[in-house]
């Protein structure tokens, strides 16, 4: 499901329950995704010993992985609502195509690697709504995503293992600095 | 057997600048969030900050300028300047295994003293 | 900006008895809530997360309860062991906040 339960509109459950705010929403949906990455993330570090590894063992990658820094105005210091909500908006985006890679890389959690994916559109589509500065949002260039997709696709085991992996903890590191900094707007 | 242990903790005059040192055994800390508490006699638990990957940190209100915290593969520093009587505490560091999106520490270090007087 | 206030200071109990501790939220912190146990002299243990989750290790005697900015820590079968210092912390956010922790609450054992 790309929404937590109880939050499609049609879910009348608990008709006693305040309607949530935008920002709650953002907040349970990225919550959602976090669960959903923490199983994936499960799968993998079972297969292999990645997960032990440092970070510093694994940092040379020639991914391209949207990472949260100083500039983009989301950390405690120098925070800058919106900017920081055009770098969230736009890292999600990016990420996309790297989840699109992670549709087939999964045995037993296949179904929750397709809903961390749509979940992560529906979230993308709750901060569009909250954002005034849509035009500062770049998008991603399609033709450079299928050609990216067609080369992290045509790794040999090893190193597609090691892309499944990076991704699913940079996109968890980069969720998690999302909802800290959305937390203080 | 993983562990914390901090280091540092002396004996300073006011104003005196001091780095405390956190350090991993066990364990790599860059995959890691770490924070700093501190305690001062007979009181309670006071955060002081923390630091995520190698550049994101957050600080208590009464932290921010006065209190930074930074991070290598092995260890995590505190550096403190401008201390006062107030400071004087024992400060323990924490690990965040990070995992999730709220914060709690389920790995402390025995703690380090830390003691400001003229 | 999520102050946590811990009642009460100090609590008395028999061996064998129940003592319960509050803690509550100044704004609504979802269930990210923590309690510690600290003796005298020793580092804190995490003993319950997510306000109800049992830490690794840590006596089925311990329970934790609460949502939003109402949380409860209830031991019972008390021991002599369990006295020492509870401290709640919200791990909700932890941006332009004065402290995470509650102010602690002391548990007698008689």
């Known amino acids: 499901a790309p929404v937590p339960p109880g939050e499609d509109s049609k879910d009348v459950a608990a008709p006693h329950r305040q309607p949530l705010t935008s920002s709650e929403r953002i907040d349970k949906q990225i919550r959602y995704i976090l669960d959903g990455i923490s199983a994936l993330r499960k799968e993998t570090c079972n297969k292999s010993n990645m997960c032990e590894s440092s970070k510093e063992a694994l940092a040379e990658n020639n991914l391209n992985l949207p990472k949260m820094a100083e500039k983009d105005g989301c950390f405690q210091s120098g925070f800058n609502e919106e900017t920081c909500l055009v770098k969230i908006i736009t890292g999600l985006l990016e990420f996309e195509v790297y989840l699109e890679y992670l549709q087939n890389r999964f045995e037993s959690s296949e179904e929750q690697a397709r809903a961390v994916q749509m979940s992560t559109k529906v979230l993308i589509q709750f901060l569009q709504k909250k954002a005034k500065n849509l035009d500062a949002i770049t998008t991603p260039d399609p033709t450079t995503n299928a050609s990216l997709l067609t080369k992290l696709q045509a790794q040999n085991q090893w190193l597609q293992d090691m892309t499944t992996h990076l991704i699913l903890r940079s996109f968890k590191e980069f969720l998690q600095s999302s909802l800290r900094a959305l937390r203080q707007m | 057997c993983q562990s914390l242990e901090e280091s540092g903790g002396r004996l300073v005059t006011p104003g005196t600048p001091l780095t405390l040192t956190c350090t991993a055994s066990?364990?790599?800390?860059?995959?890691?969030?770490v924070t700093w508490v501190r305690q001062a006699p007979g009181k309670g638990l006071e955060w002081i900050g923390i630091?995520?990957?190698?550049?994101e940190t957050a600080y208590a209100t009464s932290a921010i300028g006065r209190f930074t915290i930074s991070k290598t593969s092995t260890t995590v520093d505190l550096k403190m300047t401008s201390l006062t009587a107030a400071d004087t505490a024992t400060y323990f560091c924490a690990r965040d295994d990070s995992s999730d999106w709220d914060a709690k520490f389920n790995l402390w270090g025995q703690g380090t003293l830390v003691t400001v007087s003229s | 900006a999520y102050d946590m206030t811990q009642t009460p200071a100090s609590v008395s109990a028999a061996v064998g008895g129940t003592v319960t501790i509050k803690c509550q939220a100044s704004?609504?912190?979802?269930?990210?809530l923590s309690w510690y146990q600290q003796k005298p002299g020793q580092r804190p243990k995490l003993l319950i997360y997510r306000a109800s989750t049992l830490a690794s290790g840590v006596s089925s005697r311990f329970k934790g309860s609460g949502s939003g900015t109402e949380f409860t820590l209830t031991i019972s079968d008390l021991e002599c062991a369990d006295a020492a210092t509870y401290y709640c912390?919200?791990?909700?956010?932890?941006?332009?906040?004065?402290?995470?922790f509650g102010g602690g609450t002391e548990v007698v054992v008689k």
């Open positions: 912390q919200q791990g909700y956010s932890l941006r332009n906040i004065d402290n995470a």
């Open positions: 704004q609504s912190i979802n269930n990210e």
């Open positions: 630091i995520y990957g190698s550049d």
């Open positions: 066990g364990f790599s800390l860059s995959n890691y969030y």
